[in-house]
């Protein structure tokens, strides 16, 4: 081992405070002690230390605990967080929601990088599940958090943490995550009323299934034209035009502007047109009068 | 136990200088940046100055700067405040401190009054 | 005009709990960590609150301080006639070079 350097006389530090930010780097190693260091880690981050500083008592505390730092140390890292690699988190095992809620406001305002991904992912790991409050605190910092999970991972959400969900941190959800999520707030909004009800489960409807979309249709529930669009392709075309009308309420009008689109445009090729035209908007393309519609689903599922 | 002492005050005449000094005794001088603070009768507490262990670095108020020199012997243990130009509004106790980011320690301040 | 922000004066009965705010900007407290000073009446300040949150040695835990953004605050609590005194904030500014204070809040208990 290469031969540390000695401090020199008087500069031993008894404790960590701003006179450290004067230390050269092989003074801050020689002259800090790596115990005193991790017993006093919640005055790092209010002394302004340089990042080549940082990087010096990260050795310090790599060289006191190789097999990962202790939770103790990890809720007062601070900036020396930004310091860590995924490996080095990855020795971890946070189990404090306080501890994460620490380290994620030293991120905030940042793009989830890579250390808080590992993090987050050993925290979640650690807990089981993704209960309502640790879902709570991560979508607080990262709204997108939910739709980054792969649908086997959504399947550990309880349904009582959907009750922290908002509109937004759904927004970037595709349908095979909603697939995940519509089952379960369905049933964490279960004893609601039905105007309270739809406005909780509103943004979870692009997991809905056809028979769903049915019942809200007898429920004036006024849906607005971008929830329409979110839905199902396969859960709309079987729907009616009259149960469309009821779903939409005053918001019909709106599928002129998206016939070209799905899944209005689906949708469209799959009614009467006599049907269409009894909303009045000069909705076209739907099947002629006369011709007989063959549903060839149901026929293969007789045969 | 830490102290520090400062001496060098008094009556001085608008335009003229002063040098206050400050002795230091109970920890290692030379590992700790020093502040000189202020503060007008009746008033609140102004920064006036900071200096780092090695004196690598000098800090000023814009009120001061150009008109005072902060120094330090670390041989000797003792701060100075070199003001020159002094006027009127730099009536006030001049404290010096330890450290320059949270001043642990305080003396208990010398007076400096500028009149003619 | 003081660059960080205090209430000039706070008051309350003995044993009631007081909070002093202080208000700066990204620059200072947002950036940095705040101390605060107690100055009795005659005397030299004395540091009562370092790194934020901290107590020095024999400062009483009644004393607490806190830091949230660009504002902190610091909590007397059990008020006493001995606490009467001016309470001074401050913290480092990088943009300025210095240490700034806040214009000191008067604490009378009554």
């Known amino acids: 081992e290469v031969e540390k350097t000695a401090c020199p006389s008087g500069k031993k530090a008894r404790e960590i405070d701003e006179s450290l930010i004067f230390y050269k780097k092989w003074e801050l190693e020689a002259c800090v002690d790596a115990a005193l260091l991790a017993t006093q880690m919640d005055r790092v981050n209010a002394i302004p230390f340089t990042y080549e500083q940082l990087d010096v008592l990260k050795h310090k505390l790599d060289e006191l605990y190789p097999q990962g730092y202790p939770e103790s140390v990890i809720q007062h890292l601070g900036y020396l967080f930004l310091k860590m690699s995924p490996e080095d988190i990855r020795k971890w095992n946070v189990t404090s929601l306080e501890t994460l809620k620490a380290l994620l406001e030293v991120n905030k305002g940042h793009e989830m990088s890579p250390q808080v991904a590992t993090l987050i992912d050993r925290f979640v790991k650690g807990r089981g599940q993704l209960d309502k409050d640790t879902l709570d605190t991560l979508t607080a910092f990262y709204p997108g958090y939910l739709c980054s999970l792969s649908p086997e991972e959504l399947s550990s959400v309880p349904p009582s943490s959907i009750w922290a969900v908002r509109p937004q941190d759904l927004d970037t959800c595709d349908p095979r995550q909603l697939d995940v999520l519509y089952p379960k707030a369905r049933l964490a909004f279960q004893n609601m009323n039905g105007s309270e009800y739809f406005v909780k489960i509103q943004s979870f409807l692009g997991g809905a299934p056809t028979e769903d979309l049915k019942a809200l249709s007898q429920q004036n529930v006024s849906m607005d034209l971008a929830t329409f669009m979110k839905l199902r392709t396969d859960a709309v075309l079987p729907l009616t035009v009259a149960e469309v009308q009821k779903l939409l309420g005053p918001h019909v009008e709106g599928l002129k502007a998206e016939e070209r689109h799905r899944p209005v445009r689906d949708w469209i090729l799959r009614q009467r047109q006599d049907d269409l035209d009894t909303l009045g908007l000069g909705l076209q393309g739907g099947i002629p009068n006369g011709y007989l519609v063959l549903d060839l689903s149901m026929q293969e599922a007789l045969s | 136990e830490v102290q520090l002492l400062e001496s060098g005050g008094g009556l001085v005449q608008p335009g003229g200088s002063l040098r206050l000094s400050c002795a230091a005794s109970?920890?290692?001088?030379?590992?700790?940046?020093m502040s000189w603070v202020r503060q007008a009768p009746g008033k609140g507490l102004e920064w006036v100055s900071g200096?780092?262990?090695?004196?690598?670095?000098?800090y000023y108020a814009d009120s001061v700067r150009g008109r005072f020199t902060v120094s330090r012997d670390n041989s000797k243990n003792t701060l100075y405040l070199q003001m020159n130009s002094l006027r009127a509004e730099d009536t006030a106790v001049y404290y010096c401190?330890?450290?320059?980011?949270?001043?642990?320690?305080w003396g208990q301040g010398t007076l400096v009054t500028v009149s003619s | 005009q003081s660059v960080l922000t205090q209430p000039p004066s706070a008051s309350g009965t003995p044993g009631q709990r007081v909070t002093i705010s202080c208000t700066g900007s990204?620059?200072?407290?947002?950036?940095?960590?705040v101390s605060w000073y107690q100055q009795l009446p005659g005397t030299a300040p004395k540091l009562l609150i370092y790194?934020?949150?901290k107590r020095p040695s024999g400062v009483p835990d009644r004393f607490s301080g806190s830091k949230s953004g660009t504002s902190a605050s610091l909590a007397i609590s059990g008020l006493r006639s001995e606490d009467e005194a001016d309470y001074y904030c401050?913290?480092?500014?990088?943009?300025?070079?210095?240490?700034?204070f806040g214009g000191g809040t008067k604490v009378t208990v009554l």
């Open positions: 200096i780092p262990p090695d004196s690598g670095s000098k």
């Open positions: 401190a330890k450290n320059m980011l949270s001043f642990d320690y």
């Open positions: 109970g920890f290692t001088f030379s590992n700790y940046a």
């Open positions: 790194y934020n949150s």
């Open positions: 990204s620059s200072n407290i947002g950036s940095n960590a």
């Open positions: 401050g913290s480092w500014d990088p943009s300025l070079n210095g240490y700034v």
